[in-house]
Interface confidence: low
């Protein structure tokens, strides 16, 4: 029988009446157009909704937008368009919401052609009030808040000027001209690239990388011959043109650009690209594109300095610069990532790593599924996950994989079961152990979301027809109840729940269509009465993450330690609550060779935990570039995995000697870097 339809499924008592009392409809007095929704702050209940409608006239497009505000998680909305003087808001800039619980919001208005600059509306009280401010420039990008101080904003102008505000957009100052890209770093630092000659495009590969740590009072040039730059975790990366040809290399800095080291990664040509797939304070996943229009490349993982890299995964699917990759961080379990590879036969397969890129494997076939036509052997196959690439190919996949840090172990994704990803209509699968095992959760494509830290999963069928039914599960997707939330079906456009998965409210968005008009409508359902009581100690059970062999003393050891979590029992129907904190108990493991990556010049043969010297480097001195000096590496082939906490056990020796020689790096060495003040 289909999931959720067998006899073992207990029904939630009287749920129809409970949900009916907690279902709130809001019909927006709007023609359909487009709608965008933003949550303002965390646990505030404040939602802003911007609807826009374009009327194409003979010579121009006339636009109209409305702004609505809710302070009860979407149950009721108030039209606050008058607070922004009924101005048409530019949706391409979205609503710029301030970090944390600052309560700050910036909306960018559409202005008439001849105006001197743009116009913004600013709020610092969770959109209760707005102040209109005329800008001395036309913005090219959305206002960017400093992560450290929400009063500090930066924006690029259509004239490529870098503008900064120190008082939340009240007053603006142009701190630099000819700027291509600008980003906030830590401690209110701004990094940006500048061009000298024609334009950003013309000077690509000849840009300069600048830094200001005092909002534009003084500057330091920290790099030349720059193609692009990026920030990830505590690392600053720059791709730099080589002197002699059109290739470029990655350089990395961990001190805000004062000193640089050349990353031990392959150089790339004009048509290739680098991409930071994921980064934290410990390490980086870097994709290096293969030459030619192959659509794939190689994933490398870094050491703790971002300099020495190990090959992690070959034939990694990544179509073009800024194109599609399925790389997904499974946030519900430490060390887990999922992505796709392009196999030799041109089919796409899903791979998963549980140890931060150390080893990759196929996803285990779900117990309750059979292999499809892509499988050569009908009894042996794997689960393959649909992510960004499938969505870009317009497959019947409404959502990417979903996981939440506070819903420990839960991963939900569309997939197919075979030897490769299938274009047939996918089903929805769930894992409750971070991707080790999977179960078919729902037949056919669905939208899905996690509420109450995993206590409730909500789903809506993906259909071209109007819908009026929502499905929910209180036992991590084993059993499903259906609730008809309206008599009149709506054309569904999206599910919205507060980011962080702590809420018990879900908003169903869509539009109604009648002969004469169509209107936006939302239904907000509060599940608080379904989970009648607060969870108690007896509702939780101890779960060892990454457990694959309970007999083994080292069972659950990943990156040098194991973690036991308190997890809600599937049979418990209770509220984790908004203040729920994941309870975990870590314990350190003994070191084994699995806790070490292969050092520069070494590699791991398949199915072997030992690192052996690369044949082409045998007998050579291992020398590499570090902080602009050449270093000599004495190693027996191992280095500790970044973030690995193991102690004792195996302890390979590693020593680095300074060769006291300058590297022939293309980068500015620190002593050549210049500073200037405004």
């Amino acid at each position: 029988s289909a999931p959720g339809e067998d006899e073992e499924c207990g029904r939630v008592r009287d749920f129809v009446a409970k949900l009916a009392n907690n279902t709130h409809q809001h019909v927006f007095d709007d023609l359909r157009g487009s709608v965008s929704l933003s949550w303002v702050g965390d646990s505030t209940g404040v939602i802003l909704v911007l609807t826009t409608f374009h009327v194409p006239l003979v010579i121009m497009t006339f636009g109209q937008s409305k702004l609505y505000r809710s302070e009860d998680y979407g149950k009721n909305f108030k039209d606050i368009t008058d607070l922004i003087n009924n101005t048409f808001i530019r949706t391409e800039f979205g609503m710029a919401i301030g970090p944390e619980n600052s309560g700050k919001v910036v909306l960018t208005a559409e202005v008439s052609g001849g105006s001197r600059g743009g116009r913004i509306f600013r709020s610092s009280d969770f959109a209760k009030n707005f102040v209109q401010t005329d800008l001395p420039f036309h913005p090219l990008t959305q206002m960017m808040y400093s992560p450290q101080n929400s009063d500090y904003l930066l924006a690029l102008s259509t004239e490529n000027g870098l503008w900064v505000s120190k008082n939340f957009g009240g007053k603006w100052e142009e701190i630099h001209k000819a700027v291509c890209l600008a980003k906030w770093g830590s401690d209110n630092t701004i990094f940006f690239t500048t061009y000298a000659n024609g334009s950003c495009k013309a000077d690509l590969g000849a840009l300069e990388l600048w830094r200001t740590s005092d909002l534009g009072k003084s500057f330091k040039t920290i790099g030349v011959k720059i193609y692009s730059f990026g920030l990830g975790g505590r690392f600053l990366f720059a791709s730099v043109m080589a002197d002699k040809d059109t290739t470029r290399r990655i350089h990395v800095s961990t001190d805000q650009g004062d000193t640089w080291s050349m990353a031990q990664l392959p150089s790339v040509g004009q048509e290739q690209f680098y991409s930071i797939l994921a980064a934290n304070d410990d390490m980086v996943f870097m994709h290096v594109d293969e030459p030619g229009d192959t659509g794939f490349g190689t994933i490398f993982t870094s050491d703790d300095r971002g300099i020495v890299y190990s090959k992690s995964l070959d034939r990694h699917l990544y179509t073009t610069t800024g194109g599609e990759t399925d790389f997904t961080n499974v946030t519900s379990l430490r060390g887990v990532y999922i992505t796709s590879v392009l196999s030799e036969d041109n089919s796409i397969q899903t791979m998963i790593t549980f140890d931060q890129g150390g080893r990759w494997t196929h996803l285990r076939k779900p117990e309750n599924s059979e292999c499809d036509a892509t499988a050569k052997n009908k009894n042996e196959c794997s689960l393959h996950i649909h992510a960004s690439y499938s969505i870009s190919q317009k497959l019947n996949v409404p959502m990417a994989p979903l996981s939440e840090p506070n819903a420990v172990g839960i991963v939900i994704a569309h997939g197919s079961v075979g030897d490769a990803i299938s274009v047939m209509v996918p089903d929805v699968y769930i894992s409750d152990d971070g991707g080790y095992s999977w179960t078919k959760m729902l037949e056919g494509p669905h939208y899905y979301t996690i509420l109450d830290s995993g206590g409730i999963i909500v789903a809506i069928e993906h259909s071209s027809r109007p819908i009026n039914v929502i499905k929910f599960s209180t036992d991590e997707g084993q059993c499903w109840q259906t609730y008809t939330f309206t008599r009149d079906p709506i054309y569904f456009t999206g599910l919205a729940s507060e980011p962080g998965a702590r809420s018990m409210n879900i908003s169903i968005w869509g539009f109604t269509e009648s002969f004469l008009t169509s209107q936006w409508v939302s239904y907000t359902i509060d599940f608080k009465d379904i989970l009648e009581r607060n969870c108690e100690e007896k509702d939780y059970t101890i779960w060892l993450a990454h457990s694959t062999d309970p007999e083994d003393y080292e069972d659950g050891c990943i990156l040098g330690y194991k973690e036991q979590f308190l997890r809600l029992r599937k049979s418990s129907v209770c509220q984790n609550g908004r203040d729920y904190v994941v309870t975990k108990q870590p314990s350190i493991c003994l070191c084994s060779l699995e806790d070490f990556l292969c050092d520069f010049g070494y590699y791991r043969p398949e199915n072997d935990s030992k690192c052996v010297e690369q044949p082409e480097l045998k007998g050579h001195d291992l020398e590499f570039c570090l902080y602009g000096r050449e270093e000599h590496l004495t190693t027996n082939g191992y280095r500790k995995i970044p973030g690995d906490k193991c102690q004792g056990g195996v302890n390979p020796v590693r020593e680095v000697k300074d060769l006291k020689k300058k590297c022939t790096s293309n980068f500015l060495s620190p002593e050549k870097q210049n500073s200037k003040s405004n």
Partner: antibody, heavy 129, light 107 residues
């Protein structure tokens, strides 16, 4: 085992319609497209169209557009092909064939094709006045 | 639509010899190509898919190669049961189209 069983031979007059059935067994019916292919006496194979058993969506070859209708009944795992306004040149053996139809999403820039891996025994349709 | 052209129309080969059949597409079909074998009075049987992968249960003497517009089916050592008509078929763009077929007969 996996098999497709088609309905029996038909003799029709010009202008009439014929409906051929194809019953699938031994696999999950909703996981595979079904193609229809015909073969006139002494001629080669000609693809007519394809039906997706889940939604029932179809794609027909241009030359059959307007005359052919492909449907499915998931409760009986059966696919049907109806051809109307028959003429003598429609005399042929009609085959249904399980078609993973590019079931392996290939990347990038093309699909991966698995071929029509299971065929029905064929249904002979004779159009004669 | 994509036109598939097979050559030769007829191939006379002695048992035990090698047979090479060609299929050309009017535009690139990438590797979205299949080969079928059909014997008189029977339904076609899938031999090769994805241009080069043997279908389940197909003997190793059958091999497919090519990509884009030029494809080849090779039967390394003809057995008596291999004398039949062979069709190529593309599935790059709808409508799927077949080649006219190559008849492999006993010399």
């Amino acid at each position: 085992q996996v098999q497709l069983v088609q309905s029996g031979a038909e003799v029709k007059k010009p202008g009439a319609s014929v409906k051929v059935s194809c019953k699938a067994s031994g696999y999950t019916f909703t996981k595979y497209y079904m193609s229809w292919v015909r073969q006139a006496p002494g001629q080669g194979l000609e693809w007519m169209g394809i039906v997706n058993p889940i939604g029932g969506s179809t794609s027909y070859a241009q030359r059959f557009q307007g005359r052919v209708t492909m449907t499915r009944d998931t409760s009986t795992s059966t696919v049907y092909m109806e051809l109307s306004s028959l003429r003598s040149e429609d005399t042929a053996v009609y085959y249904c064939a399980r078609d993973p139809s590019g079931i392996g999403l290939a990347g990038p820039f093309s699909r991966y094709y698995y071929g029509m891996d299971v065929w029905g025994q064929g249904t002979t349709v004779t159009v004669s006045s | 639509e994509i036109v598939m052209t097979q050559s030769p129309a007829t191939l006379s080969v002695s048992p035990g010899e090698r047979a090479t059949l060609s299929c050309r597409a009017s535009q690139s079909v990438s590797s979205n190509l299949a080969w079928y074998q059909q014997k008189p009075g029977q339904a076609p049987r899938l031999l090769i898919y994805g241009a080069s992968t043997r279908a389940t249960g197909i003997p190793a003497r059958f091999s497919g190669s090519g990509s884009g517009t030029e494809f080849t089916l090779t039967i390394s050592s003809l057995q008596s049961e291999d004398f039949a008509v062979y069709y190529c078929q593309q599935a790059r763009l709808g409508p799927w189209t077949f080649g006219g077929g190559t008849k492999v007969e006993i010399k």
